[in-house]
């Protein structure tokens, strides 16, 4: 009976999400393997988040709006491990917008989800950021490593969206 009611709840939750995400990929987790954590298909998952790489070239603001429509934000990178996971799926000759910007050009960087900007957990390429006119951040491959660079916000780039996993 308990299992039956849990299944019914799950199905109704799945139906609820189906209007936003036609297809979800779920894995069982938790100590009794009773919880399902899901990401929209074909998003990838790492820890408690889902990631989507958009190859559409758009400005930073349009990229953020595009993520927002999908219930996500441009990616906020919190750890080196998270960055290493994300970069496994990126092309080395491309650049991707992050959810990091400095709209006033005062070098006051801010994450789109209001996560405090911690200078000690940043992965800027050497010499970056280097221009107050370049107010948005990308991740790209340079000098044999992935890192961040400040660029002009209005110039179209690819982007990475991030959202919390859906638990059902």
């Amino acid at each position: 009976n308990f299992m039956y009611s849990k299944t019914v709840k799950r199905l109704s939750k799945l139906q609820e999400y189906q209007q936003y995400y036609p297809s979800l990929t779920c894995v069982m987790e938790g100590k009794d393997m009773e919880d399902w954590s899901c990401c929209p298909t074909p998003w990838t998952s790492f820890q408690s988040s889902c990631y989507f790489i958009s190859t559409v070239m758009q400005s930073w603001t349009k990229s953020q709006n595009n993520c927002s429509v999908m219930g996500a934000d441009l990616v906020v990178i919190n750890t080196k491990e998270e960055q290493d996971f994300i970069t496994q799926n990126l092309k080395i000759n491309s650049a991707y917008f992050l959810g990091l910007s400095d709209p006033k050009g005062w070098r006051h960087w801010q994450w789109v989800d209001q996560t405090p900007y911690n200078k000690n957990v940043t992965f800027w390429h050497s010499g970056e950021p280097n221009s107050p006119d370049e107010r948005c951040a990308i991740i790209n491959f340079r000098s044999e490593e992935w890192g961040w660079n400040d660029v002009h916000c209005h110039v179209p780039q690819k982007s990475i969206c991030k959202m919390k996993k859906i638990y059902i």
Epitope: Q58, W60, T61, K62, P103, K104, D133, H152, P156
Partner: antibody
Amino acid sequence: EVQLVESGGGLVKPGGSLRLSCAASGFTFSSYGMSWVRQAPGKRLEWVATISSGDSYTYYPDSVKGRFTISRDNAKNSLYLQMNSLRAEDTAVYYCARQLYYSYGYYFDYWGQGTTVTVSS
Amino acid sequence: DIVLTQSPASLAVSPGQRATITCRASESVSFHGTHLMHWYQQKPGQPPKLLIYAASNLESGVPARFSGSGSGTDFTLTINPVEANDAANYYCQQSIEDPPTFGGGTKVEIK
């Protein structure tokens, strides 16, 4: 006083080349992004090329990509536009404009008087 | 590309009256309260001159008779009261994404 003075316009045959120059004064040229904007007779303004302050980025619309090259010499306070494979539709007044960044975009706060380019056989 | 449509194409206004020009963008040029629409004045044989930046900010040295408003896709430039030397073409421009684009212009004539 900010001044932008263009030169180098003229009459050229289709397929020909021309190099426009813009001499800047009255401000720290190396600190600003610069653009070329053109205006065909009786038409709207059209952005042609942008170069970032540090010379690290150049941008072009599809209509001129591969034919036009923007460059700058910060030591000489000068902006250039090399125009190759010119077409009749490139006929316009070409303005040099200074960019001022605002939030996620920018605007053109100073413009030169313009130089006329006529492409005709 | 973002297309900017200005209306009217031309208008004739008497000195002391109000002139209103609108600019409609094919998609939003606003983001989190910042509106990346700008206005320029161009007199015959002269380069454009910046009047208003970011929808409503008056450029230094521009008379307070000029004002701008709007957000999203719809923006307005108002001249009130109009003076004889306001006869010119007026253009809107967006810069939220490349390529920066301009409106087709509005010709203001003084009656």
